[in-house]
Amino acid sequence: DFGLDCDEHSTESRCCRYPLTVDFEAFGWDWIIAPKRYKANYCSGECEFVFLQKYPHTHLVHQANPRGSAGPCCTPTKMSPINMLYFNGKEQIIYGKIPAMVVDRCGCS
């Protein structure tokens, strides 16, 4: 699997992973104890290039162009969890691993 990494100033046109820090305090999510912010990253860019497509099926569908099919989109193809400390609905403090919170790789799907 191949994915591009870019910074916020890059003029790269292809699907790429960009840095993004999510700040829970800025959202007003005071029920999250820790972390107050974390590096989530995000995906953006064009999806016309076969080598960035996660599945051969994506390219084949795009070529076949059936009615109602959208082109491939730049989207996370690999994600990872983070550990969080937070209050649940019963005001209990929970420590747990929350899945799919960080974008590790972007691709076209």
Epitope: T11, E12, S13, R14, E48
Partner: antibody, heavy 122, light 107 residues
Framework: QVQLVQSGGGLVQPGGSLRLSCAAS????????ISWVRQAPGKGLEWVST????????YYADSVKGRFTISRDNSKNTLYLQMSSLRAEDTAVFYC???????????????WGQGTTVTVSS | DIQMTQSPATLSVSPGERATLSCRAS??????LAWYHQKPGQAPRLLIY???TRATGIPARFSGNGSGTEFTLTISSLQSEDFAVYYC?????????FGGGTKVEIK
């Protein structure tokens, strides 16, 4: 052949608004990023703004951010630049320019419009 | 922002002579560098992209070189139609930036 035909320039007072248009033909409009580049009288070239083919992403020079809005209508093959809160220093010839896609990075301009003059003066 | 600095501001050359124009970037722009020329009252025209690749229809007398932060445009034998203002431009980072231009005039 590729053509970019511009319209909408003119004389406007400081603080006023103006909308520039750029009608494109001769290429698949919705697959190319298009930009606006300006040139003040007797000066060099200054990039103003870029919009991607889908229109999803837009980029602006700091000097126009919050005052200018780039947009496109892919059904009409037309690019726009809505300019507001205009200042004397915005006086320039504005060019629309097509992205070449010669490489993966935006910003190589292979075709240019004829230019349209914007004069901001009281 | 990446600053692009061109030198000299004006270059006086006789027809048939060689002209070398310089462009310096304030930080690396990789190979994302283009050259344009502009004649009075006209829109700019793309000459070179990717440091050294000539655009469609550009004659072989135009050549580009360099890498990272130092670039040159060479016109091997100036023709009458080559007298114009030349701009380098980086498209590695937003905002896109142009050099201040080099005016090539008849000596």
């Amino acid at each position: 052949q590729v053509q970019l035909v511009q319209s909408g320039g003119g004389l406007v007072q400081p603080g006023g608004s103006l909308r520039l248009s750029c009608a494109a033909s001769g290429f698949t409009f919705n697959t190319y990023a298009i930009s606006w580049v300006r040139q003040a009288p007797g000066k060099g070239l200054e990039w103003v703004s870029t919009i991607t083919g889908s229109g999803y992403n837009t980029y602006y020079a700091d000097s126009v951010k919050g005052r200018f809005t780039i947009s496109r209508d892919n059904s009409k093959n037309t690019l726009y630049l809505q300019m507001s809160s205009l200042r004397a220093e915005d006086t320039a010839v504005f060019y629309c320019a097509k992205d070449s896609r010669y490489n993966w990075n935006y910003g190589i301009f292979d075709y240019w419009g004829q230019g349209t003059t914007v004069t901001v003066s009281s | 922002d990446i600053q692009m600095t061109q030198s000299p501001a004006t270059l006086s050359v006789s027809p048939g002579e060689r002209a070398t124009l310089s462009c310096r970037a304030s930080q690396s722009v990789s190979s994302n560098l283009a050259w344009y020329h502009q004649k009075p009252g006209q829109a700019p025209r793309l000459l070179i992209y990717g440091v050294s690749t000539r655009a469609t229809g550009i004659p072989a007398r135009f050549s580009g070189n360099g890498s990272g932060t130092e670039f040159t445009l060479t016109i091997s034998s100036l023709q009458s139609e080559d007298f114009a203002v030349y701009y380098c431009q980086q498209h590695n980072n937003w905002p896109l930036t142009f050099g201040g231009g080099t005016k090539v005039e008849i000596k």
